[in-house]
């Protein structure tokens, strides 16, 4: 069978080959085709309800006035010349439409390096067959699944055209120290190969660096964390990151009411001031960090006091992790 | 119909610009890609960049990255691109093209550069 | 970047005689995405701009003579031309467009 690809809406004329150019004419079309429970033959007398779907021209041909979905199929012709030779002629049809261009909806103006992303969602409308989207990333293809690429696909038919709704979701996690300023864009290829790909605009957005998180550190003074009663302990938080963020204090796992400080004074130590302290810096372009948590704690006349050195260490003296 | 009308040979001085510049019409100008090629005489086809009229975004082969720079005006639906620090190896026919692959081509034009 | 080489370089061949010649890539230019060859075959005749003649490897653009067809996929790819016209003289180009953009160095082909 010879392949016919046509448009949806466009006229189609099939020729009978070997039929004589004018009636009387011996030859039969058959069809097999969306609109047929089986075979439909349609003779060049024509006439009912198919003349506004397919008819028979003069010359033998067959004339699909706008093709449509249920037009593809198989259409045979077989006609007798004048001299009682028998010709036949066979094809398959198939109908496209061309949707409209891509576009890129719900595209983000800015990523964050090192974790994952929606860059947008690519959205083409009325095609048929349904074709594909795909993602292209400074002029290269990107794969799904491959290098922190994840596409989320979706294919819908509207209900009264057969035309299909195709929607592509572009997940990515740039690479730390990668482009700036990446270039993506998403391309529509058609189901028939009859038309050329159809390009989205492109979208530029910037990626954004964070800045790797330094610890936040917890000094204590005197160090190990142990004072007699009535002494006076002071807690540092000391963090790198600029600008300061702003600090605040938790004591047994519970904020203290004070104002922000990047210092804890405790004077006059009672055993009301023994507890597990720690500090929270809270950054304005991320979240709260928390420092290692430090023990304070009374010793009593006569106690030695731990070993020095032992903030954050594990099982020495008085003083451990949290 | 789609048309691409570049401007006209250019003969120009080592170490200096050119600017070349391509006209659409037949359809809109903003919703395509304009791509620019490079031949040089009896040479094959070299891809410099594009640029997408509607957002003025730009891509670059890295080779042409500082050598050109793509702009367009969208009321006179024109692409252009300025070539600078001009050498002999500059000398050569440039194209402007519409989508990829690139079924619109213009008439090209001539650059050459000569002291 | 994905290279292309193209051959023969050259070649010459009589009026009516069937012609191909060979465009290979340094990478598969098939994207798993769509099962597509993105690749485009160019005539280019002397002091024109070059014509595009196929696209998807094997895809007639429209108003191109159905004696000119590609075929190919993944690296290796062909133009045949099944009747060769006079007015086909001229330089063919392949071109890959999946990652970035490339030529392939072009075959000339010369009426005996």
């Known amino acids: 069978a010879q392949n016919i690809t046509a448009r949806i809406g466009e006229p189609l004329v099939l020729k009978c080959k070997g039929a004589p150019k004018k009636p009387p004419q011996r030859l039969e079309w058959k069809l097999n085709t969306g609109r047929t429970e089986a075979w439909k033959v349609l003779s060049p007398q024509g006439g009912g309800p198919w003349d506004s779907v397919a008819r028979v021209l003069p010359n033998g041909s067959l004339f699909l006035p706008a093709v449509g979905i249920q037009d593809e199929g198989i259409f045979r012709c077989q006609a007798m010349n004048r001299n009682g030779k028998e010709t036949k002629s066979n094809y398959r049809v198939r109908v496209y439409q061309i949707p409209g261009k891509p576009e890129i909806v719900d595209s983000a103006s800015e990523l964050t390096a090192g974790v994952p992303n929606k860059v947008g969602t690519c959205v083409s409308e009325g095609s048929y067959p349904a074709g594909t989207l795909s993602w292209h990333l400074d002029g290269k293809p990107l794969v799904p699944n491959e290098k922190g690429v994840s596409v989320k696909e979706q294919t819908r038919r509207h209900p009264e055209t057969g035309l299909f709704t195709l929607q592509s979701e572009l997940m990515v996690t740039p690479a730390r120290g990668g482009d700036p300023r990446p270039t993506f864009s998403c391309s529509f290829s058609p189901g028939l190969p009859r038309h050329r790909a159809l390009r989205t605009a492109p979208i530029q957005p910037r990626v954004w660096e964070p800045v790797p998180l330094e610890e936040v550190q917890l000094v204590v003074e005197p160090e190990g964390g142990a004072v007699a009663p009535g002494g006076t302990v002071t807690l540092t938080c000391e963090v790198p990151a600029q600008p300061s963020p702003q600090i605040h204090w938790m004591k047994d796992g519970v904020p203290l009411p004070l104002p922000p400080s990047p210092v804890l004074i405790l004077p006059e130590i009672g055993p009301q001031d023994q507890g597990t302290y720690s500090c929270v810096a809270t950054h304005s372009s991320h979240g709260p960090q928390e420092s290692r948590a430090v023990s304070i704690s009374i010793i009593e006349p006569g106690e030695e006091g731990p070993t020095a050195g032992s903030v954050g260490g594990s099982g020495l003296g008085t003083l451990a992790l949290a | 119909q789609v048309q691409l009308q570049q401007s006209g040979p250019e003969l120009v001085k080592p170490g200096t610009s050119v600017r070349i510049s391509c006209k659409a019409s037949?359809?809109?100008?903003?919703?395509?890609?304009i791509h620019w090629v490079k031949q040089r005489p009896g040479q094959g086809l070299e891809w410099i960049g594009w640029i997408y009229p509607g957002n003025v975004i730009t891509n670059y082969h890295e080779k042409f990255k500082g050598k050109a720079s793509l702009t367009a005006d969208k009321s006179s639906s024109t692409a252009y691109m300025q070539l600078s620090s001009l050498t002999s190896e500059d000398s050569a026919v440039y194209f402007c093209a519409r989508e990829d692959p690139f079924a619109y081509w213009g008439q090209g034009t001539l650059v050459t550069v000569s002291a | 970047n994905i290279m292309m080489t193209q051959s023969p370089s050259s070649l010459a061949v009589s009026a009516g005689e069937k012609v191909t010649m060979s465009c290979k890539s340094s990478?598969?230019?098939?994207?798993?995405?769509?099962?597509?060859?993105?690749l485009a075959w160019y005539q280019q005749k002397p002091g024109q701009s070059p014509k595009l003649l196929i696209y998807?490897?094997?895809t007639r653009e429209s108003g191109v003579p159905d004696r000119f067809t590609g075929s190919g996929s993944g690296t290796d790819f062909t133009l045949t031309i099944s009747s060769v016209q006079a007015e086909d003289l001229a330089v063919y180009y392949c071109?890959?467009?999946?990652?970035?953009?490339?030529f392939g160095g072009g075959t000339k082909l010369e009426i005996k």
């Open positions: 071109h890959q467009y999946l990652s970035s953009y490339t």
């Open positions: 037949g359809y809109t100008f903003t919703s395509y890609y």
């Open positions: 990478q598969s230019v098939l994207y798993s995405s769509n099962q597509k060859n993105y």
């Open positions: 998807w490897a094997s």
